[in-house]
C-alpha cells in the first residue's frame, strides 16, 4: 500500500508511518514501528506536558519565586503548569504573573481614577481635553490646564494630555 502523507488527529507521520502521539502528561520514549506502538512515559514529579505530543522532554513546572512576591495559586500536575499569584496586597505585572508590584503607576497622559487597594490595582484614565499629567504616578489625578485668561495672559502654546499650556503676555495693539 501507498505510504500515508497525512495522519489522523492525535497521530504524527514518521518514517512514512502514522504513529500515535503521547497523551498529555506523558513524553515520547520511542516512535512506533511497523510492529510496535509508540512508547510514552509519564512526566516526572515537577514536570508537565499539556498537549498530545511527541516531545522527548517534559516542561518544568513554573517556580513561584517568593523573592519576587509570588506564591502558588494552583499546584501543577503532569498535565498542567503551576499557576502563580502575588502575595496579598500585591498585583501581577502581567497575565503570566511573573513578578509582582505593590501597585502600577499611570503613565504621563493618564491620571489616577482610583488608588490601588489590597484587592484592586490602580485604575488609570486618560486625561480629557483641558487636563494633563506629565508624570508617572499611582496617586495623582489629571491636572487642569492653567487658565491664562485669569492671569491676564494669553495662550502661547496649547496644552496636551501630557503638557500644560504655556501662557505669555498679551500683544499690546499700537495706536
Amino acid at each position: 500500500p501507498e505510504p500515508p502523507t497525512a495522519c489522523r488527529e492525535k497521530q504524527y507521520l514518521i518514517n512514512s508511518q502514522c504513529c500515535s502521539l503521547c497523551q498529555p502528561g506523558q513524553k515520547l520514549v520511542s516512535d512506533c514501528t511497523e510492529f510496535t506502538e509508540t512508547e510514552c512515559l509519564p512526566c516526572g514529579e515537577s514536570e508537565f506536558l499539556d498537549t498530545w505530543n511527541r516531545e522527548t522532554h517534559c516542561h518544568q513546572h513554573k517556580y513561584c519565586d517568593p523573592n519576587l512576591g509570588l506564591r502558588v495559586q494552583q499546584k501543577g500536575t503532569s498535565e498542567t503548569d503551576t499557576i502563580c499569584t502575588c502575595e496579598e496586597g500585591w498585583h501581577c505585572t502581567s497575565e503570566a504573573c511573573e513578578s509582582c508590584v505593590l501597585h502600577r503607576s499611570c503613565s504621563p497622559g493618564f491620571g489616577v481614577k482610583q488608588i490601588a487597594t489590597g484587592v484592586s490595582d490602580t485604575i488609570c484614565e486618560p486625561c480629557p481635553v483641558g487636563f494633563f499629567s506629565n508624570v508617572s504616578s499611582a496617586f495623582e489625578k489629571c491636572h487642569p490646564w492653567t487658565s491664562c485668561e485669569t492671569k491676564d495672559l494669553v495662550v502661547q502654546q496649547a496644552g496636551t494630555n501630557k503638557t500644560d499650556v504655556v501662557c505669555g503676555p498679551q500683544d499690546r495693539l499700537r495706536a
Epitope: 523573592n67 519576587l68 512576591g69 502575588c86 502575595e87 500585591w90 505585572t93 513578578s99 509582582c100 508590584v101 505593590l102 501597585h103 502600577r104 503607576s105 508624570v135 508617572s136 504616578s137 499611582a138 496617586f139 495623582e140
Partner: nanobody, 116 residues
Framework: EVQLLESGGGLVQPGGSLRLSCAAS???????EMWWVRRAPGKGLERVA?????????YYADSVKGRFTISRDDSKNTLYLQMNSLRAEDTAVYYC?????????WGQGTLVTVSS
C-alpha cells in the same frame, strides 16, 4: 544590593508621636514618587501616604489625614513619615516603597506599636 531601609518605629503611648525614616541603599530617590504602606497584625496592606517626585503633591489615606505628614529630603536620599496623635489602630509594620514598586525593592519594615 538595591534596598529600602525603614527605621524609627517603636512602642509609643496613644496620643504620642513618632518619626519614621526610609533610606535607600543602591538606588536613588530624587524624582521618584514614594509611598508609605503599612500592614496591621492579621490585616492586609494599607496605603498610608504618598509624595510626588517633585515633593509638590501628597496623598493621605482618610484614616491618617491631619495626623500624619509625609516629606522627603532628596539630598539625603531619605523619606520621612511624621506620625502625631497616634492611635491603637496605627499599630502595624510600616514599609516605604518607590516607583516602580516591585517586590524586590521591599524592605523589612519598621514596627510601630501604639499601646498604653
Amino acid at each position: 544590593e538595591v534596598q529600602l531601609l525603614e527605621s524609627g518605629g517603636g512602642l509609643v503611648q496613644p496620643g504620642g508621636s513618632l518619626r519614621l525614616s526610609c533610606a535607600a541603599s543602591g538606588l536613588t530617590f530624587a524624582g521618584y514618587e514614594m509611598w508609605w504602606v503599612r500592614r496591621a497584625p492579621g490585616k492586609g496592606l494599607e496605603r498610608v501616604a504618598a509624595i510626588s517626585g517633585s515633593g509638590g503633591s501628597t496623598y493621605y489615606a482618610d484614616s491618617v489625614k491631619g495626623r500624619f505628614t509625609i516629606s522627603r529630603d532628596d539630598s539625603k536620599n531619605t523619606l520621612y513619615l511624621q506620625m502625631n496623635s497616634l492611635r491603637a489602630e496605627d499599630t502595624a509594620v510600616y514599609y516605604c516603597a518607590r516607583d516602580p514598586y516591585s517586590f524586590d525593592y521591599w524592605g523589612q519594615g519598621t514596627l510601630v506599636t501604639v499601646s498604653s
